[in-house]
């Protein structure tokens, strides 16, 4: 049977401190750079193997990362917001969103947020 | 997952000149970070050159010799090798990870990167 994918969308407050390689992440994304369709959001495209982010735990691939130290990322070109993580300092807060697929039921809208397209 | 297929390679004459394209898979390539590597008979695998979104980087020993470049359109990264000299011959290597580091270092660790082609040989004589 055909279903559709739903998501729950959550965000959550996470605190890095910078290891000696850094934050162990990659990101795709900027109004350059769209990764998601309509969106020019920062996005978590790889969690490197025993970083800082890795060894936190909670930061994922495919999470949008809202916010760094405050500072709002919408609206950035890819290599600026690169560059603001790059500067950001030794203790990091990020704001990030979270999607988590949570059913598949019968065929039918989209579900809310759904970046496929 | 994204596959890396490489192709140009061969023997050449010191002071001559090779082409290398790697062309991979994916939707997204315009974001990936590309890279080539070489490993020569009894050595350790070395970067080379590595094209991100912003800039190419190349290691001393190939710079002002080696160009990298890419074509989004074709999915597809080269290694321009230019006054080729006997110490470059070795087997290239192309690798790809999705996305830019937010780290600062640069980009020629090879655990940087999750994707890597079977490598095509290069023979300088």
């Known amino acids: 049977m055909n279903g559709r994918v739903d998501y729950l969308v959550t965000e959550e407050e996470i605190n890095l401190t910078r290891g000696p390689s850094g934050l162990g992440f990659n990101i795709v994304g900027g109004t350059d750079q769209q990764y998601v369709s309509n969106d020019s959001g920062i996005y978590v495209s790889r969690i490197k193997e025993n970083g800082a982010a890795a060894l936190d735990g909670r930061l994922q691939e495919g999470d949008k990362i809202l916010s760094v130290n405050g500072q709002d990322l919408k609206n950035l070109l890819h290599q600026d917001a690169v560059d603001l993580f790059r500067n950001a300092g030794y203790a990091v807060s990020l704001r990030v969103q979270h999607r988590l697929q949570v059913q598949n039921g019968p065929i039918g809208h989209r579900g809310e947020g759904d970046p496929s397209g | 997952d994204v596959q890396l297929v490489e192709s140009g390679g061969g023997s050449v004459q010191a002071g001559g000149s090779l082409r290398l394209s790697c062309t991979a898979s994916g939707r997204t390539f315009s974001t990936y970070t590309m890279a080539w590597f070489r490993q020569a008979p009894g050595k350790e695998r070395e970067f080379v050159a590595a094209?991100?979104?912003?800039?190419?980087y190349y290691a001393d020993s190939v710079t002002g010799r080696f160009t990298i470049s890419r074509d989004n359109a074709k999915n597809t990264v080269y290694l321009q090798m230019n006054s080729l000299k006997p110490e470059d011959t070795a087997v290239y290597y192309c690798?790809?990870?999705?996305?830019?580091?937010?780290?600062?270092?640069?980009?020629?660790?090879?655990?940087?990167?999750?994707?890597w082609g079977q490598g095509t040989q290069v023979t300088v004589s």
């Open positions: 094209i991100s979104w912003s800039g190419a």
């Open positions: 690798a790809a990870v999705i996305g830019s580091t937010v780290d600062s270092y640069g980009p020629g660790d090879p655990l940087e990167y999750d994707y």
